[in-house]
């Protein structure tokens, strides 16, 4: 058993049929010695008396808010949560496996630039009685500071019969130099509590590996005389690291109709303009990627050909 | 500790092309190592990230773009002194700071070159003959060093009398290639910045 936060404790249980469970001793936070009784949750049934209560925790019915009282007055609370371990593996029931970029990916993180600011998000089908707490650091043995905000519900989606909820959090490395060469990864730890179930999820990454620029901005078309070609130009996204001559981007320019199976024109360039062939009912799209370190491409920025 | 914005004469900055080739060569070599050594811990997640130039050169700090010198987090650098007669810029206006930056890059390359050559000598003794260093990568390091054209004492190639541990050598190769790729990215960014200045 360990303390998650004040008056909240996590009991780690090996979860299998007829498991013996864990013996837990609760102590009432009071100078009083006599006349103390214990109850669980809203029940008035007295579980025991005395300054300490010893319980055998085997299942979720044994978890919950234990309260010690004296003469009708509440003295203190202890909330017990369960953390299940099945076949040596901690449970991951609360969050959904996003399977990208690999299986058992519960947390996904992205950064728009090298400033040390990043966003992580996760998915769940649970809608109520759910809380998250996020901590982060650079490295684990001698951790350097990363400050994370509160996790918030950022999107709701319908997936077949189920509703899916996306939560996200923004974090900022306390002292980040955009030009630095990372040797220690960022560690992100998410504590998830659903009713009386506790789970924790972690992710470890270098900012350079989670870079995904915003789409290029200000796409403009200029038809070329006596030709089917158009010159398309754009600018670096505002959120990208500066100076741009140091943090350079490369671009992919594509002309395509509404269907992905339609024919297309595609060209890659390091410049902020390109010449392509425009077709009726097609769109010109441009996306960006770090020129020197191939992490993710940005989403497309698009304009219609006409 | 930073690069002044004005200087290089018009025309292609001679080192840019070489630095692009360097990044390409080390990336290809790293990809090849990951594929060939698939049963060794050779991915970014699996290896320890070591920098053999740590406390010996200060490329990131010496080559910091002017715009980033206002960022306190970028300025906790170590002072290191370097020889300052580089020819990469082909310009009399080469500033002291820029020469410091380029000579730091030169020292990095020299250190990696020695490590890679020592390692290759060991890998050539491996009866499995599983992986060797790409001669193109070694040639590209050499070309960029020549373009930088700094005079400095040659570092003797380390020779080892004991029987090499090939497993350890291959893991060390992965560690070295990952670190060198990151440094090659920095070098490319620096050359691109200088070319645009």
């Amino acid at each position: 058993i360990w303390e998650l936060k004040k008056d909240v404790y996590v009991v780690e249980l090996d979860w299998y049929p007829d498991a013996p469970g864990e013996m837990v001793v609760l102590t009432c936070d009071t100078p009083e010695e006599d006349g103390i009784t214990w109850t669980l949750d809203q029940s008035s049934e007295v579980l025991g008396s005395g300054k300490t209560l010893t319980i055998q925790v085997k299942e979720f019915g044994d978890a919950g808010q234990y309260t010690c009282h004296k003469g009708g007055e509440v003295l203190s609370h202890s909330l017990l949560l369960l953390h299940k371990k099945e076949d040596g593996i901690w449970s991951t029931d609360i969050l959904k496996d996003q399977k990208e970029p690999k299986n058992k990916t519960f947390l996904r993180c992205e950064a728009k630039n090298y400033s040390g600011r990043f966003t992580c998000w996760w998915l769940t089908t649970i809608s109520t009685d759910l809380t998250f707490s996020v901590k982060s650091s650079r490295g684990s043995s001698d951790p350097q500071g990363v400050t994370c905000g509160a996790a918030t519900l950022s999107a709701e989606r319908v997936r077949g019969d189920n509703k899916e909820y996306e939560y996200s959090v923004e974090c900022q490395e306390d002292s980040a130099c955009p030009a630095a060469e990372e040797s220690l990864p960022i560690e992100v730890m998410v504590d998830a509590v659903h009713k009386l179930k506790y789970e924790n999820y972690t992710s470890s990454f270098f900012i350079r590996d989670i870079i995904k620029p915003d789409p290029p901005k200000n796409l403009q078309l200029k038809p070329l005389k006596n030709s089917r070609q158009v010159e398309v130009s754009w600018e670096y996204p505002d959120t990208w690291s500066t100076p741009h001559s140091y943090f350079s981007l490369t671009f992919c320019v594509q002309v395509q109709g509404k269907s992905k199976r339609e024919k297309k024109d595609r060209v890659f360039t390091d410049k902020t303009s390109a010449t392509v062939i425009c077709r009726k009912n097609a769109s010109i799209s441009v996306r960006a990627q770090d020129r020197y370190y191939s992490s993710s491409w940005s989403e497309w920025a698009s304009v219609p050909c006409s | 500790r930073n690069l002044p914005v004005a200087t290089p004469d018009p025309g292609m900055f001679p080192c840019l092309h070489h630095s692009q080739n360097l990044l390409r060569a080390v990336s290809n070599m790293l990809q090849k190592a990951r594929q060939t050594l698939e049963f060794y811990p050779c991915t970014s997640e699996e290896i320890d990230h070591e920098d053999i130039t740590k406390d010996k050169t200060s490329t990131v700090e010496a080559c910091l773009p002017l715009e980033l010198t206002k960022n306190e987090s970028c300025l906790n650098s170590r002072e290191t002194s370097f020889i300052t007669n580089g020819s990469c810029l082909a310009s009399r206006k080469t500033s002291f700071m820029m020469a410091l930056c380029l000579s730091s890059i030169y020292e990095d390359l020299k250190m990696y070159q020695v490590e890679f050559k020592t390692m290759n000598a060991k890998l050539l003794m491996d009866p499995k003959r599983q992986i060797f260093l790409d001669q193109n990568m070694l040639a590209v390091i050499d070309e960029l060093m020549q373009a930088l054209n700094f005079n400095s004492e040659t570092v003797p190639q380390k020779s080892s009398l004991e029987e090499p541990d090939f497993y350890k050598t291959k893991i060390k190769l992965c560690i070295l290639l990952h670190a060198f790729r990151i440094r090659a990215v920095t070098i490319d960014r620096v050359m691109s910045y200088l070319n645009a200045s």
Epitope: Q229, K263, V267 | -
Partner: antibody, heavy 118, light 107 residues
Framework: QVQLVQSGAEVKKPGSSVKVSCKAS????????LHWVRQAPGQGLEWMGW????????EYAPKFQGRVTITADESTSTAYMELSSLRSEDTAVYYC???????????WGQGTLVTVSS | DIVMTQSPLSLPVTPGEPASISCRAS??????LHWYQQKPGQAQRLLIY???QSISGVPSRFSGSGSGTDFTLTISSLQPEDFATYYC?????????FGQGTKVEIK
Amino acid sequence: QVQLVQSGAEVKKPGSSVKVSCKASGGTFSDYYLHWVRQAPGQGLEWMGWIDPENGDTEYAPKFQGRVTITADESTSTAYMELSSLRSEDTAVYYCARNKELRYFDVWGQGTLVTVSS
Amino acid sequence: DIVMTQSPLSLPVTPGEPASISCRASQSISINLHWYQQKPGQAQRLLIYFASQSISGVPSRFSGSGSGTDFTLTISSLQPEDFATYYCQQSNSFPLTFGQGTKVEIK
């Protein structure tokens, strides 16, 4: 199986014209760009131009502008390349090639030898 | 027009050995570079597109690398059926242009 089948070899006099055909099978004809590329004896490949069979849009290499006409007949899934004012240096194997991507070629025809000789 | 220069023009190789063909562009073309194989009496075959992207059905011994002005086609271990002429082609701008070709011959 996608295939491009070209017409047979031709011998032409200088100053005349030649029209080479390229019949496509497999896949929808108008879903692909169609290009013509030539190769003179012992020489490299030379791109001549492309057509979008869907709308008849064409683009020609400046070197052949005014002398080459590329057309397409959707009903027969056939593309044509006509080269006029032939000279001896136009002696070459002419290839048609196609792709859903405009700028490179994933399927090629077998080639048609055009000999220009007086 | 962008000029593509291949080297060497002729490459004698022993079967089983690796082979590398270089292609250089007269100006930067990013990764807009494609490789083809030509055998006598056969249609051209696309091997690699956009400098390094492999084609399904093309043996994995064929790989491409490069960006900007310098590109390489590598055949890791030459098989008897690989003796052919190889062409690079740029698609950075029109007119599309090809290298002069490299003939890989049996040593």
